[in-house]
């Protein structure tokens, strides 16, 4: 599998409509919780929790602060921690407890604490529960949690130093935790946890399971350096621990290695960064998407692998176990266990078969079974990805978070759209297209290029958004910027399953937001722009320049995958010649203008889609070079480098074949100058030249003036 290409379009922060939320002096907006039925997004930050309107996160609804007392700060600082940063209260757990309350935990100056947040009054109840085992002591330590039927399942560290890892269930009825033993958890870095409900019609009376994802130090592979291994672990919701062996401990804790590698190159991705569980009506079994980087990542590699949950469950239900054996110098080696396995199967959830054998609860399990799972929590079999290869491998980027949306294109094809954030504050949107990856676009969510810490996807039909949290705030972005594609060609070439061209309105529309039936809409995920209706009209921009000056003719082609070239009087221009230059790889510079330079200039783009090359006329300019008569009174001018003098610009209508403006761009401003009649169209084509006028008759100005033709925006 080849590396993923660059994103086709790059949207700068200012180019697209992004809604932001941040409060002065509040940082680390790393906990996000969405209440779809209330259209409310809850944000956990450092020392604060906010409720904002999920449809417009700039609208704050409530806020509550949970600060650390000076006394606690001082005690924390005495232990060698920073009073300004570490000895504060970082909200790390933000989970729904009931319809009217949230369960919130914070690091609380290295004394983790939890409380209930009443959503009506938006005040804490002051329970001040001990957060040990539910929330890390250190804000820098890894953590994950999920609330299941009113009980919090967490993966974090259990002590001040962060040296005792724990996966626990906080429950008044039956609290459970992992054994503090290397075979169970070996310096894990927790990533994600979620519950997978068993289908009600499940024939074996199975239990719900809670899955944990983490990276840990390998026990089974021995090298000179510590080898990191990505893991999937699971526990059963109905687990009550053992009666004697594994008392108050999981009897169902099993873990396995997650494989994400490129078989042809030996490239192994062994550091897990994030996981997203994709549930969809069309999916019998959930699929989980996992985001990885290699352990030694000096080149900025990231990969996404997708897994069927049934593959993982098969490993836990029927796979072989690993066992530690002592070799010379009391050295421990882990090998496949081939001996007899006790019954009931160690680590299995209590199902109807177990109940039939009178094992109605884990408290009934025989000590042989419990002792076995205590000693053999690691599976020998690994969990392999769908198609045995990554969905995406990207070079020169460090991905941080992932969310995935399953959507249906106009032709009925289902696409899993991956939204992947980077450590530079950007969001990539990617899909698999016939065994290749297409990165539809990159959106710069955060101006300061800071890492995205949290990603959240709304699942409500209609208004769909991605929410991203970082150190400085939260950004809300739509799933697609369809309206930014100003022509049918742009819309089609975007190959965005959310977008289709609407000929009646001559706009690129978001599919899920169109109330009207999809008849007549144009979407071609192959990128075949020939389906677009012929354009009978296009527009020229006419410019008059003075002799000897320099002209810059604009061509705003947004596609990073397109190659731009210029034609003059139907001959291709060579930008390397002394006469011409390219500005920003797209705009044409014509030096030392003479009458011979008058004529029609066309900017064309060439983009390879599959095995076809799509040509587009992006911009057309008519240039007329005139000798400008000297003004009666020569104004005093400051000395500037001039780019030519434009006397007038007017739009002419001309018949063209298949002309089409652009696709989106890196830093170009949008303009609708190509199509007629001129109207607001946020496309990425801009045709007007940037002209510096240094001598203009009838202007009694004493300074240089910069004039631009209107953008028709």
């Amino acid at each position: 599998m080849a590396f993923a290409p660059i994103p086709r379009i790059t949207w700068e922060h200012r180019e697209v409509h992004l809604v932001q939320f941040h409060e002065p002096d509040i940082y680390n907006y790393s906990a996000l919780l969405l209440s779809e039925d209330k259209d409310t997004l809850y944000i956990g930050a450092r020392e604060a929790v906010f409720a904002v309107n999920a449809l417009n996160i700039s609208e704050k609804q409530h806020e509550v602060y949970w600060k650390v007392s000076e006394d606690k700060k001082a005690k924390c600082a005495e232990k060698g921690k920073s009073k300004q940063t570490e000895c504060l209260n970082y909200i790390r757990v933000l989970q729904p407890l009931s319809a009217t309350s949230l369960y919130v935990c914070g690091t609380n100056a290295f004394q983790p604490a939890c409380d209930h947040l009443n959503l009506t009054s938006f005040k804490f109840l002051g329970k001040n529960e001990d957060g040990k085992g539910r929330c890390p002591f250190d804000p820098a330590h890894s953590y994950t949690s999920v609330m299941v039927d009113g009980e919090l399942y967490s993966g974090t560290s259990y002590n001040f130093l962060g040296s005792e890892p724990i996966i626990s269930r906080n429950s008044s009825h039956s609290p459970l935790r992992t054994e503090y033993a290397i075979p169970w958890l070996n310096e894990p870095s927790f990533v994600f946890a979620d519950v997978i409900r068993k289908s009600p019609d499940s024939p074996d009376g199975e239990d719900d399971r809670v899955y944990f994802f983490f990276t840990e130090v390998s026990v089974e592979y021995e090298f000179v350096f510590r080898v990191l291994i990505p893991r999937i672990a699971r526990v059963c919701k109905g687990d009550q621990g053992g009666l004697r062996t594994l008392q108050k401990k999981w009897t169902s804790f099993l873990k396995a290695r997650l494989i994400c590698s490129r078989p042809d190159s030996g490239l192994v991705f062994n550091v897990l960064r994030d996981v997203f569980v994709l549930r969809s009506p069309g999916l019998k079994v959930p699929v989980f998407y996992a985001l990885f980087t290699p352990q030694l990542n000096n080149v900025g590699l990231s990969a996404v692998c997708a897994y069927n949950l049934s593959t993982a469950e098969e490993v836990f239900s029927h796979g072989k176990y690993m066992q530690s054996t002592t070799v010379e110098q009391s050295h421990t080696k882990w090998v496949r266990y081939n001996g007899p396995v006790p019954k009931p199967r160690p680590g299995a959830c209590i199902d109807s078969e177990a109940r039939a054998a009178n094992y109605t609860s884990s408290l009934n399990l025989p000590d042989k079974t419990l002792q076995f799972v205590k000693d053999h929590p690691l599976m020998d079999d690994s969990v392999t990805p769908i198609d045995n290869r990554p969905r995406l491998i990207k070079k020169d980027v460090n991905y941080t978070q992932i969310v995935v949306d399953r959507t249906q294109a106009l032709d009925g094809t289902v696409y899993d759209v991956m939204f992947v954030s980077t450590d530079r504050g950007a969001l990539h949107k990617a899909i698999s297209l016939e065994h290749a990856v297409h990165i539809i676009e990159e959106t710069q969510l955060f101006q300061d290029f800071e890492p995205v810490q949290t990603l959240l996807l709304s699942s409500k039909k209609g208004n769909r958004f991605v929410y991203a949290g970082s150190n400085s705030g939260v950004v809300q972005a739509p799933l697609a910027f369809c309206g930014k594609h100003g022509t049918c060609e742009d819309c089609v070439l975007a190959r965005d399953p959310y977008c289709a061209w609407s000929p009646p309105t001559a706009t690129c529309v978001a599919l899920h937001q169109t109330e009207s039936p999809s008849r007549g809409l144009i979407q071609e995920m192959s990128g075949d722009a020939s389906v677009c209706p012929d354009k009978s009209k296009g527009s020229y921009r006419q410019h008059f320049f003075k002799h000897g000056g320099t002209a810059e003719l604009k061509c705003s082609q947004k596609s990073n995958l397109a190659r731009v070239f210029w034609k003059f009087q139907n001959g291709v221009l060579k930008a390397e010649s002394p006469k011409y230059g390219l500005m920003g790889r797209k705009n044409l510079l014509i030096f030392n203008l003479s009458e011979g330079d008058s004529g029609v200039y066309q900017c064309l783009s060439e983009e390879r889609v599959k095995n076809k090359t799509v040509f587009q006329v992006v911009a057309k300019h008519v240039l007329e070079v005139k000798v400008v008569p000297k003004p009666v009174v020569a104004p005093t001018l400051s000395v500037v480098q001039t780019e030519g003098s434009r006397i007038a610009t007017k739009v002419l209508v001309a018949s063209t074949q298949g002309s089409s403006p652009p696709t989106p761009a890196v830093q170009a401003t949008s303009s609708g100058a190509i199509t007629l009649p001129p109207k607001p169209a946020p496309t990425g084509t801009s045709c007007e030249p940037k002209i510096v006028i240094n001598t203009v008759p009838q202007l009694h100005s004493e300074k240089t003036m910069y004039l631009k033709s209107s953008d028709n925006r």
């Epitope: 009666l243 004697r244 008392q247 108050k248 009178n358 408290l363 009934n364 025989p366």
Partner: antibody, heavy 122, light 108 residues
Framework: QVTLKESGPTLVKPTQTLTLACSFS??????????VTWIRQPPGKALEWLAL???????YYSTSLKTRLTISKDTSKNQVVLTMTNMDPVDTATYYC??????????????WGQGTLVTVSS | SSELTQAPSVSVSPGQTASITCSGD??????VYWYQQKPGQPPVLVIY???KRPSGIPERFSGSNSGNTATLTISATQALDEADYYC???????????FGTGTKVTVL
């Protein structure tokens, strides 16, 4: 109704082996999760746990007495037998057998026999 | 360590609350059981698995277990609550049950 009854000698000489039987009714030691355990209590002193046998024939012993104890079961007779070697006067105590309940509400010594006092003396 | 330590005695006036503690290393990792024993009788379970009450045991008996200490609380103590109380736990490191040293509760 669950009943347990301990039987065995009331007087044992030092260095001798003590054999105690626990006869029970109202439950079966073949039922998943069920176990029978032995506890003793020297006069005026605290309870001390001795040994356990469960339905799966797993056996556990007090670490301090492990070398001297043996527990076994005869499910057909509904009986559990404890033997303790090398008796000493400090082993003088009331010896109890008890049923360990199973399942969600289990884990505790649910039903006790009345106990049998064993005196070790020459 | 396989030791569970209890205060030898606790005195309480009728109607008052008696708290009996049981200390042991990382006790909250283990289930704690509480037994009441009256003279000449075998013990009777009053609390199992830290805080659960068997049927037939009055509501005034409650249990908790946190850190290194488990507590049996008898609220509105009555004269008939006068007895010896033992805590008990399973010590997984040595695979054995351990009883506490016992607390004599006297109702004044």
């Amino acid at each position: 109704q669950v009943t347990l009854k301990e039987s065995g000698p009331t007087l044992v000489k030092p260095t001798q082996t003590l054999t105690l039987a626990c006869s029970f009714s109202g439950f079966s030691l073949t039922t998943t999760g069920v176990a029978v355990t032995w506890i003793r209590q020297p006069p005026g002193k605290a309870l001390e746990w001795l040994a356990l046998i469960d339905w799966d024939d797993d056996k556990y012993y007090s670490t301090s007495l492990k070398t001297r104890l043996t527990i076994s079961k005869d499910t057909s007779k509904n009986q559990v037998v404890l033997t303790m070697t090398n008796m000493d006067p400090v082993d003088t105590a009331t010896y109890y057998c008890a049923r360990i309940a199973s399942g969600d509400s289990g884990g505790y010594f649910a039903d006790w026999g009345q106990g049998t006092l064993v005196t070790v003396s020459s | 360590s396989s030791e569970l330590t209890q205060a030898p005695s606790v005195s309480v006036s009728p109607g008052q609350t008696a708290s009996i503690t049981c200390s042991g290393d990382k006790l909250d990792d283990k289930y704690v059981y509480w037994y009441q024993q009256k003279p000449g009788q075998p013990p009777v379970l009053v609390i199992y698995r830290d805080n659960k009450r068997p049927s037939g045991i009055p509501e005034r008996f409650s249990g908790s277990n946190s850190g290194n200490t488990a507590t049996l609380t008898i609220s509105a103590t009555q004269a008939l609550d006068e007895a010896d109380y033992y805590c008990q736990a399973w010590e997984s490191s040595s695979d054995q049950y351990v009883f506490g040293t016992g607390t004599k509760v006297t109702v004044l």
